[in-house]
């Protein structure tokens, strides 16, 4: 595995993920056994989990993790202060927000404390490893007889995220999807009044602030349906377990909020 890292002068430096220090011996010693790969993900730039497969070790071993930032003011080697465990064996390390510097090259080193020469070092670009929380507060606005607009919120700097909207009707066998840029708004121009619709959204830290490949989890789905009647606009909303809210500032538009998000607001 190779990781491309940006050097301070902007040049790319392709460096092997693992630097194995081994004894110069013909026989296979403990120190030549490869250490598991460390996988790091930054969750919503609130905390970071760096984990490894502890069960890949030939015998249960409490591997230790050290980290630092290359060529920066934060280049002092730090010990993991919050280990994650799997069956009482270290399997990860959690770093808090203050320890995360997205735009500096993060260096993580895994070590076998019983064999200090058995260690592996990886360099990671954290801005490519951000996973945002799922979008929330999905709302639907009926802009006209046949047009719906979907809006949502993210607990993050919105301009850093791109989004993927999936929608379907009760007649469909597969999702239809549409990419959406940082504006977190999606419009469906032609709605069939005889069908029920379901929408869901996920987000990714790409491309303006990073180049993450991993998407967030999907939002709770929100539904819109055929028997939202003019006489009783609450009919379908209640049947579909959604709450239909009339808001003066919507200029008479109907606004549909998913029940999960409504509960969230009530409890906070």
């Amino acid at each position: 595995l190779n990781t491309t890292i940006l050097t301070p002068n902007g040049n790319e430096d392709t460096t092997a993920d693992f630097f194995l220090t081994t004894m110069p011996t013909d026989s296979l010693s403990v120190s030549t056994l490869p250490l598991p790969e460390v996988q790091c993900f930054v969750f919503n730039v609130e905390y970071m989990n760096c984990t490894w497969n502890s069960s890949s070790e030939p015998q249960p071993t409490n591997l230790t993790l050290h980290y630092w930032y290359k060529n920066s003011d934060n280049d002092k080697v730090q010990k993991c202060s919050h280990y994650l465990f799997s069956e009482e064996i270290t399997s990860g390390c959690q770093l808090q927000k203050k320890e995360i510097h997205l735009y500096q090259t993060f260096v993580v080193q895994l070590q076998d404390p019983r064999e200090p020469r058995r260690q592996a070092t990886q360099m990671l670009k954290l801005q490519n490893l951000v996973i945002p929380w799922a979008p929330e507060n999905l709302t639907l606005h009926k802009l006209s007889e046949s047009q719906l607009e979907l809006n949502w919120n993210n607990r993050f700097l919105n301009h850093c995220l791109e989004h993927l909207v999936q929608y379907r009707t009760d007649w469909d066998h597969s999702w239809t999807e549409q990419s959406v840029d940082y504006r977190h708004k999606f419009s469906l121009p032609s709605v069939d009044g005889q069908k029920r619709y379901t929408f869901r959204v996920r987000s990714r830290f790409n491309p303006l602030c990073g180049s993450a490949q991993h998407w967030s989890e999907w939002s709770h789905p929100i539904h819109w349906g055929s028997n939202t009647s003019k006489e009783n606009p609450f009919l379908f909303a209640l049947e579909a377990e959604q709450k239909l809210i009339s808001e003066e500032d919507l200029g008479g538009e109907q606004k549909l909020i998913s029940e999960e998000d409504l509960h969230h607001h009530h409890h906070h």
Epitope: Q166, D170, D172, H173, S174, K195, E241
Partner: antibody
Framework: EVQLVESGGGVVRPGGSLRLSCAAS????????MSWVRQAPGKGLEWISS????????DYADSVKGRFTISRDNAKNSLFLQMSSLRAEDTALYHC?????????WGQGTLVTVSS | DIQMTQSPSSLSASVGDRVTITCRAS??????LNWYQQKPGKAPKLLIY???SLQSGVPSRFSGSGSGTDFTLTISSLQPEDFATYYC??????????FGQGTRLEIK
């Protein structure tokens, strides 16, 4: 005529791995999301996983999440299920089906037996 | 997760009978409900989607109705080839997609 033909099943020990394949013909494969649904001997139907039309997103049942991976190759009209860390309770007939949540067409299934 | 409960679990009927199978969801699923037929040793076959829409090629003696939590599959005049197991399936709140436990329809 629509055809979905599964292969790759067999007998495997607990903790082992298998890769199932499904060859599709008779319909426009990339117009459809695809799914795997299993049926334990003498039991009902259990949805396992679905993948969207372009392979960009997938959903999994909690019972297989982290152990099974669904994928597809639209150029070859093929659907796959990589199964690892298999357990006795994964023993079932595995069907591939067209659609992500409405299953229009089904294969006859391939039998996976997990036994020591 | 949404639970789907079918009733009865099994039933005996004769050719020409009108048969009704019910499916109840643990919460409202609007009309996101599908019905399948499975014969022994065969793959399931889609009969009804969106609660009441007949899949292409399925005989018109099959019909579906219901919305919200309660749904029915009706066979207006039972034919010999209709003896099979029937499953309902919700796709309202996914994942997961969930099926009913099945209703076995046997010859009386």
């Amino acid at each position: 005529e629509v055809q979905l033909v599964e292969s790759g099943g067999g007998v495997v020990r607990p903790g082992g791995s298998l890769r199932l394949s499904c060859a599709a013909s008779g319909f426009t494969f990339d117009d459809y999301g695809m799914s795997w649904v299993r049926q334990a001997p003498g039991k009902g139907l259990e949805w396992i996983s679905s993948i969207n039309r372009n392979g960009g997103s997938a959903d999994y049942a909690d019972s297989v999440k982290g152990r099974f991976t669904i994928s597809r190759d639209n150029a070859k009209n093929s659907l796959f299920l990589q199964m690892s860390s298999l357990r006795a309770e994964d023993t079932a007939l595995y069907h591939c089906a067209s659609g992500e949540f409405r299953f229009d067409y089904w294969g006859q299934g391939t039998l996976v037996t997990v036994s020591s | 997760d949404i639970q789907m409960t079918q009733s009865p679990s099994s039933l005996s009927a004769s050719v020409g009978d009108r048969v009704t199978i019910t499916c109840r969801a643990s919460q409202s699923i609007s009309s996101y409900l599908n019905w399948y037929q499975q014969k022994p040793g065969k793959a399931p076959k889609l009969l009804i989607y969106a609660a009441s829409s007949l899949q292409s090629g399925v005989p018109s003696r099959f019909s579906g109705s219901g919305s919200g939590t309660d749904f029915t599959l009706t066979i207006s005049s039972l034919q010999p080839e209709d003896f099979a197991t029937y499953y309902c399936q919700q796709s309202y709140s996914t994942p997961p997609i969930t099926f009913g436990q099945g209703t076995r329809l046997e010859i009386k």
